[in-house]
C-alpha cells in the first residue's frame, strides 16, 4: 500500500513540475527591465526565451519573437537546449511511469517489469528536473553577469554613441517557476525511484530437497514446512523434517521402496 | 549594431518651418523611445519631444505648440516638424533611440551625430 501510495505520489508531483517546466519555457517574463528613468512614457521591457516584450503606462504591450537562431547569445541557446532536453525527458517518463503504476493493470505485466519502468521514469524525471535547474540557473548566472557588468559606453563613432541603458534589471517570474518546477519533478522522480525498491519482487528460493520416508507413517511437525528465502534461519540447508526429510547435501541413497524423487 | 542618422537640418528664417528626420539602421530587433535633444552653444542637452513605441508623446513646454513629433514604426523613422521657429532654437538637434538588443541581451541608447538648426532674426 505504501509502495503504491509513494508510487503514485511521485508520479502527480513530477506531472506537475514537468507542466511547470513546459510553462517556464514559454513563459514571457524570464528577464524585466524597469525603465522608470525614460523620459518619455515609464516602460517595462521583458524577455523569454522565444520573444521579448514591451509594456507601456499607456498600456501598449508588443512582443517581437527572436526570429532568427544567429545574434542571440550562446548562453540563450544553451537554455533553451536544457529546457527543451527536460520537457522531453519529462513527457517520455510520464509516459512510461502510467504504464508502471501498480493501480493500473495492462495484460499481464509482471511486477519486476513494472519494477523496472518504475525505475526508468523515476530516472528520466531526475535528469528532467535537473535539466531544468541547471537551465534557469544558467540564465540567471547570464543576466547577474551581463548587468553587473560596466554600463560605460560601448562605442563612439562618427559623432553618435551607443550606451547600455541604466535600468533596474530584475529575475522574472519565470525563473522562480522554473525552479520550483525543476525542484518538483527532481522530487517525483527520487520518490519513483524508492518506490521501484518496494516494487521489485523478493527472490524466493526454494531448496532442492529430496524426502526419505523411513517407513509408511511419517510424523510430519505442523507448520514444518518452511520455503526457504535466504533471510530465515534456514540457510545452511539443515534439515526441516524430523522424518527423514535430508537436503541434497546430506542425501545418502538407500535404495527403497517408499523414496520420492 | 544600431545607428540612427538626422537629417533636415539647416538654415531658416524666423518664424518660417523646418522637419527635421531620424532614420535608424542596422541589426535593429526592436526600438522602444524615441527622442529629439538639442544643444545650443554654452548649455546642456535637453529633451525636446520624445514619442514611444505605442505612440506616447512627451514635449518640453518651450516648444508645446509649435512642434509635433511623429514617428513611423515599421520604418524605424521619427519626424520632428518644427513651426513658428524662433531664435531660441538655434542648436545642434540630437536623435535619440533606446533598443532591445537580443544579441547582447541588453538595453541600448543610441546616439546620432547631430544636425544643425540655425534660425536667423
Known amino acids: 500500500m505504501a509502495v503504491t501510495a509513494c508510487q503514485g505520489l511521485g508520479f502527480v508531483v513530477s506531472l506537475i513540475g514537468i507542466a511547470g517546466i513546459i510553462a517556464a519555457t514559454c513563459m514571457d517574463q524570464w528577464s524585466t527591465q524597469d525603465l522608470y528613468n525614460n523620459p518619455v512614457t515609464a516602460v517595462f521591457n521583458y524577455q523569454g526565451l522565444w520573444r521579448s516584450c514591451v509594456r507601456e503606462s499607456s498600456g501598449f504591450t508588443e512582443c517581437r519573437g527572436y526570429f532568427t537562431l544567429l545574434g542571440l547569445p550562446a548562453m540563450l541557446q544553451a537554455v533553451r537546449a536544457l529546457m527543451i532536453v527536460g520537457i522531453v525527458l519529462g513527457a517520455i517518463g510520464l509516459l512510461v511511469s502510467i504504464f508502471a503504476l501498480k493501480c493500473i493493470r495492462i495484460g499481464s505485466m509482471e511486477d519486476s517489469a513494472k519494477a523496472n519502468m518504475t525505475l526508468t521514469s523515476g530516472i528520466m524525471f531526475i535528469v528532467s528536473g535537473l535539466c531544468a535547474i541547471a537551465g534557469v540557473s544558467v540564465f540567471a548566472n547570464m543576466l547577474v553577469t551581463n548587468f553587473w557588468m560596466s554600463t560605460a559606453n560601448m562605442y563612439t563613432g562618427m559623432g553618435g554613441m551607443v550606451q547600455t541603458v541604466q535600468t533596474r534589471y530584475t529575475f522574472g517570474a519565470a525563473l522562480f517557476v522554473g525552479w520550483v518546477a525543476g525542484g518538483l519533478t527532481l522530487i517525483g522522480g527520487v520518490m519513483m525511484c524508492i518506490a521501484c525498491r518496494g516494487l521489485a519482487p523478493e527472490e524466493t528460493n526454494y531448496k532442492a530437497v529430496s524426502y526419505h520416508a523411513s517407513g509408511h507413517s511419517v510424523a510430519y511437525k505442523p507448520g514444518g514446512f518452511k520455503a526457504s528465502t535466504g533471510f530465515g534461519s534456514n540457510t545452511k540447508n539443515k534439515k526441516i523434517y524430523d522424518g527423514g526429510a535430508r537436503t541434497e547435501d546430506e542425501v545418502q541413497s538407500y535404495p527403497s521402496k517408499h523414496d520420492y524423487v | 549594431e544600431v545607428q540612427v542618422q538626422e537629417s533636415g537640418g539647416g538654415l531658416v528664417q524666423a518664424g518660417t518651418s523646418l522637419r527635421l528626420s531620424c532614420a535608424a539602421s542596422?541589426?535593429?530587433?526592436?526600438?522602444?523611445?524615441m527622442g529629439w535633444y538639442r544643444q545650443a552653444p554654452g548649455k546642456q542637452r535637453e529633451l525636446v519631444a520624445g514619442?514611444?513605441?505605442?505612440?506616447?508623446?512627451t514635449y518640453a513646454h518651450s516648444v508645446k505648440e509649435r512642434f509635433t513629433i511623429s514617428r513611423d514604426n515599421a520604418k524605424n523613422t521619427m519626424y520632428l516638424q518644427m513651426n513658428s521657429l524662433k531664435s531660441e532654437d538655434t542648436a545642434g538637434y540630437y536623435c535619440?533611440?533606446?533598443?532591445?538588443?537580443?544579441?547582447?541581451?541588453?538595453?541600448?541608447?543610441?546616439w546620432g551625430q547631430g544636425t544643425l538648426v540655425t534660425v536667423s532674426a
Open positions: 535619440n533611440a533606446q533598443a532591445w538588443d537580443p544579441g547582447t541581451f541588453r538595453y541600448l541608447e543610441v
Open positions: 542596422g541589426n535593429i530587433f526592436r526600438i522602444d523611445t
Open positions: 514619442i514611444s513605441r505605442g505612440g506616447t508623446t
